[in-house]
């Protein structure tokens, strides 16, 4: 019995005065607690407790279930205990099959013994299966067997407490160990789409998938810079013991423009947190924005090819696209395709392929596109660069020599005189009159220039050259002169095309 200094309250004393008592099943248990301030006896086994306010605890016919710790407490809160084993060969273990383990922690298999003198108190696997090699345990006859540092691999492990009695192995009822995993990584979160574009009134629904080792993972949808609670629905699955998946679906049944913003799916566990975001843009109505990929004014040489290319954003998706020239719609020579195969793509490309353009094919080429909400168009002004062509070269009745040339860009006409039989005409002659004429063709057609010189200035036989040129090339026409007496006579004019 404990000894204390005089004057200080002392713990109660128990008779019999020993820490452990062994009785046989059917025998009497008689425990006496002596203390002037006696309060109660408490009996504990398998974490369950019973109380008795009598200072003498008497059990007339002891049963195995009377095995346990008997504690006497006084009014000062001081106590003393005795542990009683009720030896019953037919019931060697008291069992509570509640067996939960947390990964990396210890857990107690509650199978205290009714007889401390049996041997080889240990754990065994069910149906003769061996225990995992790394499973370590510590037996305690009064409490059970402590499994040290529970592993995830022990989940649903079936085991028995075991002792040797008279040379034979005796097993307890079976225990099934349920292991809760420890979080050793942050949750894995993903979102069904990274961005959403909707019209007002349409439903917004986005799903976040959270993956972790158990359903204890916390997750929520949050709106950035807002505390408002969002309505979400859950579905979840266990793909095996430590592979848990939750789908958290956020829905706004009728989205408004002010619902636009960034939504975050946030998940955390005891290890850490993870998040993923999705962006919602709500527009009051659909739109189309066209972006030319080349200048809308295009210059191209006669006979060459050109591609007219536009990119455009269309929401909702485009329904009709066409290329038009001179009120005629192209049925081929163009292609239209999405810029990406991404499900949320709203950007498209349209290309019109113009091949071997003729001078007469300049003009306005228009791309038109529409969706259920809007129409949009863009025009390309195509100019075809052509080498000058001399349309007329005549001697007029008033003695003027006139040269009319057409081309694009606007040709320049220069005049030269070659005396006698010289081949090279180098002496330039200033024109009397130069006019740009209105073409009767389309506004993007060739430009026509008329230039005149006075032939009276020429006093000798020779050749007059009319040379029309622009950035693309040059063409010449010639007037041959011969004098008969005082009369000047025009010999047939002819042209020489100079490359």
């Amino acid at each position: 019995q404990p000894s204390v200094s005089p004057g200080e309250p002392s713990p109660p004393s128990i008779h019999p005065g020993k820490s452990d008592l062994i009785v046989r099943v059917g025998d009497e248990i008689r425990l006496l607690c002596t203390d002037p301030g006696f309060v109660k006896w408490t009996f504990e086994i398998l974490d369950e407790t019973n109380e008795n306010k009598q200072n003498e605890w008497i059990t007339e016919k002891a049963e195995a279930t009377n095995t346990g710790k008997y504690t006497c407490t006084n009014k000062h809160g001081l106590s003393n205990s005795i542990y009683v084993f009720v030896r019953d060969p037919a019931k060697l273990f008291l069992v509570d099959r509640s067996l939960y383990g947390k990964e990396d922690n210890d857990t107690l298999v509650r199978c205290p013994l009714t007889d401390p003198e049996v041997t080889n108190y240990s754990l065994k696997g069910c149906q003769g299966k061996p225990l995992p090699k790394d499973l370590r345990f510590i037996p305690d006859p009064k409490a059970g067997i402590m499994i040290k540092s529970v592993k995830r691999a022990y989940h649903r492990l079936c085991l028995h407490c075991s002792v040797d009695q008279e040379g034979k192995s005796v097993l307890s009822e079976k225990f099934i160990l349920k292991v809760r995993p420890a979080f050793k990584a942050v949750p894995v979160v993903s979102v069904s789409k990274a961005s959403y574009l909707l019209r007002e009134g349409e439903e917004f629904t986005v799903t976040c998938t959270i993956k972790d080792v158990s359903s204890s993972v916390y997750s929520t949808w949050k709106r950035e810079n807002s505390q408002t609670k969002l309505q979400e629905k859950y579905n979840s699955w266990h793909h095996g013991d430590f592979n848990y998946e939750r789908q958290a679906t956020l829905t706004i049944s009728s989205a408004r423009v002010n619902d636009s913003g960034v939504f975050m799916c946030y998940a955390n566990n005891t290890f850490g947190s993870a998040n993923v975001t999705t962006t919602l843009e709500v527009v009051d109505k659909g739109f189309i924005n066209i972006f030319p990929m080349i200048n809308t004014t295009v210059f191209v040489n006669d006979g060459e090819n050109v591609d007219l290319i536009v990119e455009y954003e269309a929401f909702p998706k485009p329904e009709h696209q066409q290329w038009i020239y001179m009120n005629r719609t192209f049925t081929d020579k163009w292609e239209d395709y999405p810029k990406s195969e991404n499900e949320s793509n709203i950007r498209y490309v349209s290309e019109l392929h113009l091949t071997r353009l003729k001078g007469t094919e300049g003009g306005t080429y228009t791309f038109l596109v529409s969706n259920s909400d809007v129409n949009a168009a863009i025009a390309f002004n195509v100019y075809v660069n052509t080498k000058p062509e001399i349309l007329t070269y005549d001697r007029l009745v008033n003695g003027m020599l006139q040269c009319v040339a057409a081309g694009f860009p606007e040709p320049t006409i220069d005049w030269y005189f070659c005396p006698g039989t010289e081949q090279r005409c180098s002496a330039s002659v200033l024109p009397v009159d130069v006019q740009t004429l209105n073409s009767s063709g389309p506004p993007f057609g060739k430009l026509v220039v008329q230039s005149s010189i006075d032939s009276s200035a020429f006093k000798h036989n020779g050749t007059v050259e009319c040379k029309a040129y622009n950035d693309v090339g040059k063409t010449s026409a010639y007037f041959n002169f011969a004098f008969k007496g005082n009369n000047k006579e025009q010999i047939h004019p002819h042209t020489l095309f100079t490359p």
Partner: antibody, heavy 116, light 107 residues
Amino acid sequence: QVQLKESGPGLVQPSQTLSLTCTVSGFSLTSYLVHWVRQPPGKTLEWVGLMWNDGDTSYNSALKSRLSISRDTSKSQVFLKMHSLQAEDTATYYCARESNLGFTYWGHGTLVTVSS
Amino acid sequence: DIQMTQSPASLSASLEEIVTITCKASQGIDDDLSWYQQKPGKSPQLLIYDVTRLADGVPSRFSGSRSGTQYSLKISRPQVADSGIYYCLQSYSTPYTFGAGTKLELK
């Protein structure tokens, strides 16, 4: 002898917070799991949440955003707090002890009415 | 979450019949299934745990079985005292889930 007893207000105003206590005796909270289960009048049982023996908690998915379960082992008490109550939270709330044998012990339940 | 689909919702049986109540789990729950009986105004009482094992004090006319993810509670030759509502509960993983209940009336 194992016992569980629920206590708390019988009437809660809508949008207010419910606080319930489950006081246990005859066993230790560090050895057993204690669950909260509720049952609206005339309806089925609904699992609310659980306090694990090591102090961890698990919750019903539909309620977890407004639910919290805690404990005081020295007083052998488990607490349930649920905020933003609505009429559909009207129910008898039970606490129950689980071992591997199932929910072997139940409290008698406490009726909580959500009404103004 | 794991759904437990319980059927029938109610049944009326005579004392000579064998009553069968079933619960189907939406995914595998191993043997983590228990059955409870509840009488009006009372707390539920454990009948069967681990699919087949009878809780202390439960008469042997109650039995449990499993086929895949379908679990059954059988009451052979039910007695008047067996009337009440029966629930299954999966404890395979949190969140735990109950079946919707079966109301048993005895003629």
